[in-house]
């Protein structure tokens, strides 16, 4: 198995992590996709997932996590808004393809969130916390948990990540179709 690689992103509290995970267009377009945190000992845990089948350009918000699957571009966009120091950890995008193992989209994201300096745009928590006030619903999780080791047989597409401050974020207050999709770091 190929060694798992990771990209490190250092952000300030209040900023937004914006990750684009590329995938093969036709093959995985409607497959359910998920954002996971990696616990100690290679134990991924799902934090949020798209619907099943995954809808095109349809935002799914789970707390401060927003997933958007762009079928036409073959990418899953993951945003974690209003970042907190406790969000620091190792994350990955995966595509569910039961009964087979989930397909992991490289690279893993090593997120390091530090305290912002007062007065800097990235440290203004209030600029995002009211925009993303959609609580999770309480229906049973739709995301299955796959626990097999993440092995890779070929070099998968690379994921890319951008960062932005709260001021550049899109207001998602009218996102109503929220999928409730659990977590260790």
């Amino acid at each position: 198995a190929t060694k798992l690689t990771e990209e490190k992103y250092e952000l300030k509290e209040g900023q937004t992590l914006d990750v684009k995970c590329d995938y093969t267009l036709e093959k995985f377009a409607s497959s359910q996709k998920a954002w996971q945190i990696i616990r100690d000992g290679e134990m991924p845990k799902t934090l949020a997932c798209t619907e099943r089948p995954s809808k095109n350009s349809h935002p799914v918000q789970v707390g401060r996590i927003i997933l958007e699957d762009y079928h036409d571009h073959g990418l899953l966009r993951v945003r974690m808004v209003n970042l907190q120091v406790e969000d620091s950890g190792l994350y990955q995008c995966v595509i569910y393809q039961p009964p087979k193992e989930p397909h992991m989209l490289f690279d893993r994201i090593r997120l390091v969130v530090t305290k912002g300096f007062s007065g800097t745009p990235g440290s203004n928590e209030n600029s995002t916390q009211n925009v993303y006030k959609i609580p999770p619903t309480t229906t049973k999780a739709l995301c299955p948990l796959y626990t097999s080791p993440r092995t890779v047989t070929q070099a998968p597409p690379k994921s890319t990540a951008d960062v932005s401050t709260p001021d550049s974020e899109i207001n998602l207050t009218n996102v109503t179709d929220i999928i409730r999709v659990p977590v260790f770091n």
């Epitope: 290679e42 999770p136 739709l142």
Partner: antibody, heavy 120, light 112 residues
Framework: QVQLVQSGAEVKKPGASVKVSCKAS????????MHWVRQAPGQGLEWMGV????????SYAQKFQGRVTMTRDTSTSTVYMELSSLRSEDTAVYYC?????????????WGQGTLVTVSS | DIVMTQSPLSLPVTPGEPASISCRSS???????????LDWYLQKPGQSPQLLIY???NRASGVPDRFSGSGSGTDFTLKISRVEAEDVGVYYC?????????FGGGTKVEIK
């Protein structure tokens, strides 16, 4: 239905090792993480670690690092917890507990417990 | 490690009366997905623990509706609206926000 059946009580001498088993049935064994939690007599619950039954990877509490080994046998749907260099403070009931799937990180099924007594 | 502090240590109750147990964590248990990773278990005498509440406020399947969980971040409460004799045992909160998982010290509920 889901069942976790643990091995019987053990009496060990200080310095020895003990290996407790937990046989799972009623679900897909490799699809759920399995944790080990112990409880000393009259005391509270203490998390020891977790094993991924599919890949066999593990994560242990710092306190038990170097003394505990968690393994699994997928052919028999059994997980094992071995604790070495036993001391009297290790006298406890040891539980295996299955972690729920999806987002909900709770223990939905527990074994009946295995009493391990460490005494000279 | 996250430290979980439960109170009271012991709670003598009268059947039919309400009861409340508090649990505090040294760090926030609220994850980025909006869920509080705090669960409540009841361990009846001579039995394995059983799940009551998960993710802070969700009642587990088969748990009577007299049990409710509330709170967010670092402060959580388990409430029993009307205690029944079968509710005696030790109640534990546990955080599943990060490894190592850590349990509260337990609250022993007994009938007066």
């Amino acid at each position: 239905q889901v069942q976790l059946v643990q091995s019987g009580a053990e009496v060990k001498k200080p310095g020895a090792s003990v290996k407790v088993s937990c046989k799972a049935s009623g679900y897909t064994f490799t699809s759920y993480y399995m944790h080990w939690v112990r409880q000393a007599p009259g005391q509270g619950l203490e998390w020891m670690g977790v094993i991924n039954p599919s890949g066999g990877s593990t994560s242990y509490a710092q306190k038990f690092q170097g003394r505990v080994t968690m393994t699994r046998d997928t052919s028999t749907s059994t997980v094992y917890m071995e604790l070495s260099s036993l001391r009297s403070e290790d006298t406890a009931v040891y539980y295996c507990a299955r972690e729920s799937d999806g987002i909900d990180s709770y223990f939905d099924y527990w074994g009946q417990g295995t009493l391990v007594t460490v005494s000279s | 490690d996250i430290v979980m502090t439960q109170s009271p240590l012991s709670l003598p109750v009268t059947p039919g009366e309400p009861a409340s147990i508090s649990c505090r964590s040294s760090q926030s248990l609220l994850h980025s997905n909006g869920y509080n990773y705090l669960d409540w278990y009841l361990q009846k005498p001579g039995q394995s623990p059983q799940l009551l509440i998960y993710l802070g406020s969700n009642r587990a399947s088969g748990v009577p509706d007299r049990f409710s969980g509330s709170g967010s971040g670092t402060d959580f409460t388990l409430k029993i609206s009307r205690v029944e004799a079968e509710d005696v045992g030790v109640y534990y909160c546990v955080q599943a926000r990060q490894t190592p998982l850590t349990f509260g010290g337990g609250t022993k509920v007994e009938i007066k």
